[in-house]
Interface confidence: medium
Amino acid sequence: NFMYSKTVKRLSKLREYQQYHPSLTCVMEGKDIEDWSCCPTPWTSFQSSCYFISTGMQSWTKSQKNCSVMGADLVVINTREEQDFIIQNLKRNSSYFLGLSDPGGRRHWQWVDQTPYNENVTFWHSGEPNNLDERCAIINFRSSEEWGWNDIHCHVPQKSICKMKKIYI
């Protein structure tokens, strides 16, 4: 009976996500058969989050809207380990919007999910950010420094990275 009600709950939860994510890839968390964590197929997973590389070229605002339609946000990078995971799925000749912007052009950077901006956990390329009229952040590859962040104009179409919390069922 307990197993039956658990299954019913899982099915109703899966139905919630079906609209945006017709297919989920789930893995068993730990040793308990009851706990599964899922990411939409073909998103990738790292720790408690799912990631999607959007290859369509759009402005920052449109990229964020595109992520939000999928129940996600443009990516917020919290650690070096997280960035190291993300870059494994990126192409060196492309740039990708992050969920980081400076709307007022006063170098008050802010993350889309209101995570406090911490100067100590940023990965700007050397000399960046350097253009006051460029108020959105991308991650890109520079041969001298590998992967890092750069400020660019928010209207310039780029690829993007979406991030959402894992779905637990």
């Epitope: 605002t61 350097n130 253009n131 006051l132 009229d133 660019i152 104009h153 209207h155 310039v156 179409p157």
Partner: antibody, heavy 122, light 111 residues
Framework: EVKLVESGGGLVKSGGSLKLSCEVS????????ISWVRQTPEKRLEWVAY????????YYPDSVKGRFTISRDNARNTLYLQMSSLRSEDTAMYYC???????????????WGQGTSVTVSS | DIVLTQSPASLAVSLGQRATISCKAS??????????LHWFQQKPGQPPKLLIY???NLESGIPARFSGSGSGTDFTLNIHPVEEEDAATYYC?????????FGGGTKLEIK
């Protein structure tokens, strides 16, 4: 007084190259994004290239991508446009133009030079 | 690319009357509540001069007889009362989508 002065235009054969310059004065060049915009003989205006204030970001329309390169020397207050593999459709008056100093308004040019004429003959 | 269609291609207006120029975009030029549509004036032998940015903001030094309105895809430049020195070609430009594009121009003649 804000001034932008273009030079380097002229007559060039199809497939040839040309380097345009734009010397600026009257404002802090290194703080402003600059674009090249051209005007065809039919008076049609077409954006050609953009370079960020720091010189690290450059953008081009498909019509010139791979053929034109925009660059700047902030120490010399000078903007450049290197044009190669020139075609007859590149014949135009080329203007350098300063962007409005508002990040919210993209590609809005508030001051323009007098232009330099480029003619590509076949 | 966003196509901007200006109309009329040319118009003649009597001194002191109103000149109205229309600019229609092939898709919305709204970006986060800002209308990224701008107006320029160009006189023969001169470069374009910015008159109005973001649909309705008058650039500094431009006389108040110039005004802009509109949103989404339909925009208008009004000049009232028209003066002799307003004889020129007027262009609209959008900056919402890369690449930025310009309208074909409207030539204003003063009668």
């Amino acid at each position: 007084e804000v001034k932008l002065v273009e030079s380097g235009g002229g007559l060039v054969k199809s497939g040839g190259s040309l380097k345009l310059s734009c010397e600026v004065s009257g404002f802090t060049f290194s703080s402003y994004t600059i674009s090249w915009v051209r005007q065809t003989p039919e008076k049609r205006l077409e954006w050609v290239a953009y370079i960020s204030s720091g010189g690290d970001n450059a953008y081009y329309p498909d019509s010139v991508k791979g053929r034109f390169t925009i660059s700047r020397d902030n120490a010399r207050n000078t903007l450049y446009l290197q044009m190669s593999s020139l075609r007859s459709e590149d014949t135009a008056m080329y203007y350098c133009a300063r962007h409005l100093y508002y990040g919210d308004y993209f590609y809005v040019m508030d001051y323009w030079g007098q232009g330099t004429s480029v003619t590509v003959s076949s | 690319d966003i196509v901007l269609t200006q109309s009329p291609a040319s118009l003649a207006v009597s001194l002191g009357q109103r000149a109205t120029i229309s600019c229609k975009a092939s898709q919305s030029v709204d970006y986060d509540g800002d209308n990224c549509l701008h107006w320029f004036q160009q006189k023969p032998g001169q470069p374009p001069k910015l008159l109005i940015y973001a649909a309705s903001n008058l650039e500094s030094g431009i006389p108040a007889r110039f005004s802009g309105s509109g949103s989404g895809t339909d925009f208008t430049l009004n000049i009232h009362p028209v003066e002799e020195e307003d004889a020129a070609t007027y262009y609209c430009q959008q900056s919402n989508e890369d690449p930025p594009t310009f309208g074909g121009g409207t030539k204003l003649e003063i009668k």
